[in-house]
């Protein structure tokens, strides 16, 4: 199955060139997407090419500049946010990255009605998080781990919390582990729909062990970075949820929301908060042993000014075959009655589907069903539910958008995207305006990405927002590799794979094979998306075949495949990569003396274990920032899949599944180990321990560290990394430079 823009005929082939590594490192063939910044049912904001902030009205067809690029430039703004009453814009500058989502910034408020910046009671700097209320122009912000409230941008702030302390108490923002492994946001505060209440989380990290590493910088002495980071089995953060009335914040102060008794009886997590109305809120909690989740609906008691969470409004979600949810426990999407909701969880056949919960989870009405999975609920309106799934044509690596009419009986289902641009577009996401009056579709491939605007009632395409014409033109004289997505059936397991083939691929010839692996629980690598990246270059210029395989533990193909790795990380993921390689060899075009594997993060762990599997299949391989022992990784992530590293739980497999335990097996492979010294996520410790074990076993290997670089190895390190890995692979495969 060729999933690429069609190629020109042979007569023109001599004018075409292969991809170069420089193309990849310069981002020459990167694409653009267009996500409207919706501000009403029919209006959105977008930053124009010349940096003006422009308001578009779909219905009138008019647009005007709401904020001049002169204003943006005056404070070097890199981001903006319009207040819902449209009177103010915050401008964000001095962006300073912290972890994956978190950053600090300086904020300026521009008054659109007066055409000038607000000067009185300016915001402090740097701010950790800032947001407008959903109505009007109240501001909530986090500064030095405390939350502040402003009724208007020019007003003096009201301090809500006072106990915030660096690395100890976090108010309104998550600590490291909650940011990375639970909330996946930089914030931990939530406005009620009309801005009456503000809910926030307090994380107490006082008792959490600290990871410390050197940051070398330019000074005479390195700095030490200290992060409260709970590794598997360690003491976890203590979380509390509070809600404050923002109209009269000083009246009763923040009120704590009670934790369900069945959750509070042992270590637990808070997983998400969803406002239903101004006086009803839904909290989700999770036991530390992450197979039990409780959804708790709480109501405001006017008489006591407290929040009441009756047991009758507690909904339990439990997994008997694995952990609760997919990567995260799904969040509810409430319907207009403000009590019933739609939620994705496993059905009786072990496939994640949309269910409608009116009273109890036991009585849930299944909305979607089949041997495929519902992936995301985008929007629920009075008469429609929009969701994405991988149902169409039974390709798990596709995403199409569907509409179910919930206003009529029986509900009817329509695929909105399946036949729009069938060859070009098989992987979509969507962005909806208020009441789903309009929506944008963003297609990621397999062809060149395209973003379009649609009528929410008729699904009619209104206009193309971004079609990447420049990219299309730039690729006209490039020999892109061919891509195919197929599946292998092995011992009742379906292994989907993507193969990237050199442009002049000839089945009768032999090619070196590179396996690119991630393989983490609930991940998916085989997706029908467009990419011109390093592996595209390796196929196009260096004549390699590259394969990506989704084995056991990967997502969106049912619980049997997903939960197969439960409590046994590092076993089946590796087995399935090896099985696939053997199948690829059987296809006849792979040079079995030139097979390599590489991966990053979890993929670095899998590639290391595959190299040390003793099969003799791999000549060489690369591990970038690998996990080497699950005892070194974060509690929230690790324990979800592995349980606890205690004797009475799963310590044995924690010990058996390390890379270090297989040090001897690296003797007959060429191994390149790479890690950033300032990796806050997968600590450098992981690679340090691999290196130590290899040295102790007197096994030769290659290594590269990147000073002061984190898990992403960004900036100039990226160029160095890919250049270095290219040399390593070309040497391994005896390819001339």
């Amino acid at each position: 199955i060729v999933l690429r823009p069609s190629r020109v005929h042979n007569s023109e082939e001599n004018t075409m060139r292969a991809l170069t590594l420089k193309d990849i490192l310069n981002g020459t063939f990167s694409y653009k997407t267009f996500f409207p910044n919706w501000i009403s049912g029919q209006e959105y904001l977008h930053q124009s090419a010349d940096n003006n902030i422009v308001l578009y009205n779909i219905e009138t067809g008019q647009s005007y500049t709401i904020l001049s690029n002169r204003t943006m430039k005056s404070v070097n703004a890199s981001n903006y946010g319009l207040s819902p009453d449209r009177q103010f814009v915050y401008l964000e500058s001095d962006y300073s990255k912290l972890w994956r989502y978190s950053y600090t910034a300086t904020y300026y408020i521009y008054d659109l009605s007066n055409g000038e910046f607000v000067r009185g009671n300016e915001l402090p700097r740097p701010i950790q998080y800032l947001c407008w209320s959903p109505v009007g122009s109240k501001l909530a912000y986090v500064y030095q781990n405390n939350i502040y409230l402003k009724q208007r941008p020019g007003d003096p702030p009201f301090q809500i919390t006072f106990n915030g302390r660096e690395n100890k108490i976090f108010n309104g923002i998550p600590d490291w582990v909650y940011e990375e492994e639970m909330l996946a946001t930089k914030y931990a505060l939530w406005w009620s729909p009309n801005g009456k209440f503000l809910a926030y989380a307090e994380f107490n990290d006082t008792d959490i062990p600290v990871i410390a590493y050197s940051y070398y910088g330019d000074e005479q002495y390195p700095r030490t970075i200290n992060i409260p980071y709970p590794k598997a089995g360690a003491k976890n953060p203590v979380v509390r949820i509070f809600i404050i009335d923002t109209t009269y914040p000083a009246y009763v102060g923040p009120q704590e929301v009670p934790v369900p008794a069945m959750i509070a009886s042992s270590d637990y997590y808070f997983s998400w908060l969803t406002w239903v109305t101004d006086e009803r809120v839904c909290l989700q909690w999770l036991k530390r042993v992450q197979n039990v989740s409780v959804l708790s609906i709480c109501d405001f008691r006017e008489d006591w000014q407290t929040w009441d969470c009756p047991k009758t409004q507690e909904h339990i979600e439990e997994s008997r075959t694995g952990w609760a949810g997919g990567f995260f426990v799904s969040t509810p999407v409430f319907s207009y009655d403000a009590i019933s909701y739609y939620k994705i969880f496993s059905d009786k056949d072990g496939y994640k589907h949309i269910h409608y919960i009116k009273d109890t989870v036991e009585n849930a009405i299944q909305i979607t069903s089949g041997k495929w999975e519902a992936i995301n609920i985008f929007r629920v309106t009075q008469d429609s539910l929009f969701y994405s799934s991988n149902e169409f044509e039974e390709y798990p690596g596709r995403r199409n958008i569907y509409r179910i009419s919930i206003g009529s009986y029986p509900p009817s289902k329509k695929c909105v995207t399946c036949h729009l641009r069938k060859e070009r577009c098989q992987y979509y996401t969507a962005s909806f305006s208020d009441y789903a009056k309009y929506y944008a579709l963003v297609c990621y491939g397999p062809g060149i990405p395209i973003s379009t605007l649609h009528d929410g009632r008729t699904d009619q395409e209104i206009k193309i927002l971004e079609e990447n014409k420049e990219l299309e033109n730039a690729l006209k004289n490039i020999q892109l590799p061919k891509e195919e997505i197929k599946k292998l059936e092995v011992d009742e397991i379906t292994l989907w794979y993507k193969m990237i083939l050199p442009p002049q691929f000839d089945r009768s010839k032999k090619y070196p094979l590179l396996i690119q692996v991630y393989g983490g629980p609930c991940s998916q690598s085989v997706r029908s998306v467009f990419a011109v990246n390093w592996i595209s270059y390796l196929a196009s210029k260096e004549g390699m075949v590259i394969a990506l395989v989704d084995g056991r533990g990967t997502a969106f193909q049912g619980d049997k495949l997903l939960y197969a790795v439960y409590r046994k990380l590092g076993v089946y993921e590796v087995e399935d990569q090896i099985t696939a390689v053997r199948k690829f060899i059987e296809m006849g075009f792979i040079d079995e003396k030139r097979i390599a594997i590489w991966g990053w993060s979890y993929g670095g762990y899998v590639s290391s274990l595959a190299l040390a599997s003793g099969t003799g299949l791999f000549k060489c391989g690369i591990a970038v920032a690998p996990v080497s022992s699950w005892e070194y990784y974060a509690s929230v992530y690790t324990e979800r899949f592995m349980g606890l590293p205690t004797k009475d739980d799963n310590l044995e497999h924690y010990k058996n599944s390390t890379v270090m335990a297989r040090a001897e097996y690296f003797r007959n492979v060429d191994y390149l180990l790479i890690h950033g010294t300032a990796d806050d996520n997968v600590h450098f410790q992981n690679s340090a321990q691999i290196a130590k074990a290899l040295v102790n076993a007197q096994v030769d290997f290659q290594a590269m560290w990147y000073s002061d670089q984190n898990h992403g190895l960004s900036g100039l390190s990226t160029n160095h990394l890919y250049t270095h890995m290219t040399h390593f692979l070309k040497q391994c495969f005896s390819l001339s430079d």
Epitope: L55, Y64, T65, I66, S68, R70, T71, S74, V75, R86, Q87, Y108, D111, L112, S113, N114, G115, E116, F117, V118, R119, G120, G154
Partner: antibody, heavy 124, light 113 residues
Framework: QVQLVQSGAEVKKPGASVKVSCKTS????????IHWVRQAPGQRLEWIGG????????NYNQKFKGRVTITVDTSASTAYMELSSLRSEDTAVYYC?????????????????WGQGTLVTVSS | DIVMTQSPDSLAVSLGERATINCKSS????????????LAWYQQKPGQPPKLLIF???TRESGVPDRFSGSGFGTDFTLTISSLQAEDVAVYYC?????????FGQGTKVEIK
């Protein structure tokens, strides 16, 4: 020479509404916000509110909120101020004035040109 | 709201003499980021609209005679007419434009002694 020309004097009964116009000329209308200021007999100048012609977003003095509506007609380079539920203490001269938009962070401008004023008398 | 208080309420000065009007704000009008004071002075003659004389506390508007000068910072400001002329008889207002609502002083009436 920049001009801000206001509509003529009005006599209104208590409870009624008045709408005063301010026609501008000889400058780029969208480079300035328009503000309304009133002066009751023997009283200090009092700011009522303003509007940005680029986006039509008004800003009102809380004292007048709910009673005042400021609008613009960009095509006619004209601003309007409507005050409702009039009472005798609203008797005053109403002025419009322009104020340059501050695009830059370090800017900020005073009201440099004013209309001639419109006398509004509220009497039963 | 920022309250602006002028003193004196009225002032009689001989022709050619110096006239000094003070204005005090309830909050500082000095903007730390650009070290500018967001204060203006206006002149209003009977039956006429106010006319801008001084902005940023000390910068003369173009066309304003140099006998008019402004000074001060923070909360205390002064308008000085170095040599009073007959055409300077008017009411003078200070106004802050540091924050909203914009507010004016109560005015100082300048007459010839």
């Amino acid at each position: 020479q920049v001009q801000l020309v206001q509509s003529g004097a009005e006599v209104k009964k208590p409870g009624a509404s008045v709408k005063v116009s301010c026609k501008t000329s000889r400058y780029t209308f969208t480079e300035y916000t328009i503000h309304w200021v009133r002066q009751a007999p023997g009283q200090r100048l009092e700011w009522i509110g303003g509007i940005n012609p680029n986006n039509g977003i008004p800003n009102y003095n809380q004292k007048f909120k709910g009673r005042v509506t400021i609008t613009v007609d960009t095509s006619a380079s004209t601003a309007y101020m409507e005050l409702s539920s009039l009472r005798s203490e609203d008797t005053a001269v109403y002025y419009c004035a322009r104020r340059r938009i501050a695009y830059g962070y370090d800017e900020g401008h005073a009201m440099d040109y004013w209309g001639q004023g419109t006398l509004v008398t509220v009497s039963s | 709201d920022i309250v602006m208080t002028q003193s004196p309420d009225s002032l009689a000065v001989s022709l050619g003499e110096r006239a000094t009007i003070n204005c005090k704000s309830s909050e500082s009008l000095l903007y730390s980021r650009n070290q500018k004071n967001y204060l203006a002075w206006y002149q209003q003659k009977p039956g006429q609209p106010p006319k801008l004389l001084i902005f940023w506390a000390s910068t003369r508007e173009s066309g304003v005679p140099d006998r008019f000068s402004g000074s001060g910072f923070g909360t205390d400001f002064t308008l000085t007419i170095s040599s009073l002329q007959a055409e300077d008889v008017a009411v003078y207002y200070c106004q802050q434009y540091f924050s909203y609502p914009l507010t004016f002083g109560q005015g100082t009436k300048v007459e010839i002694k």
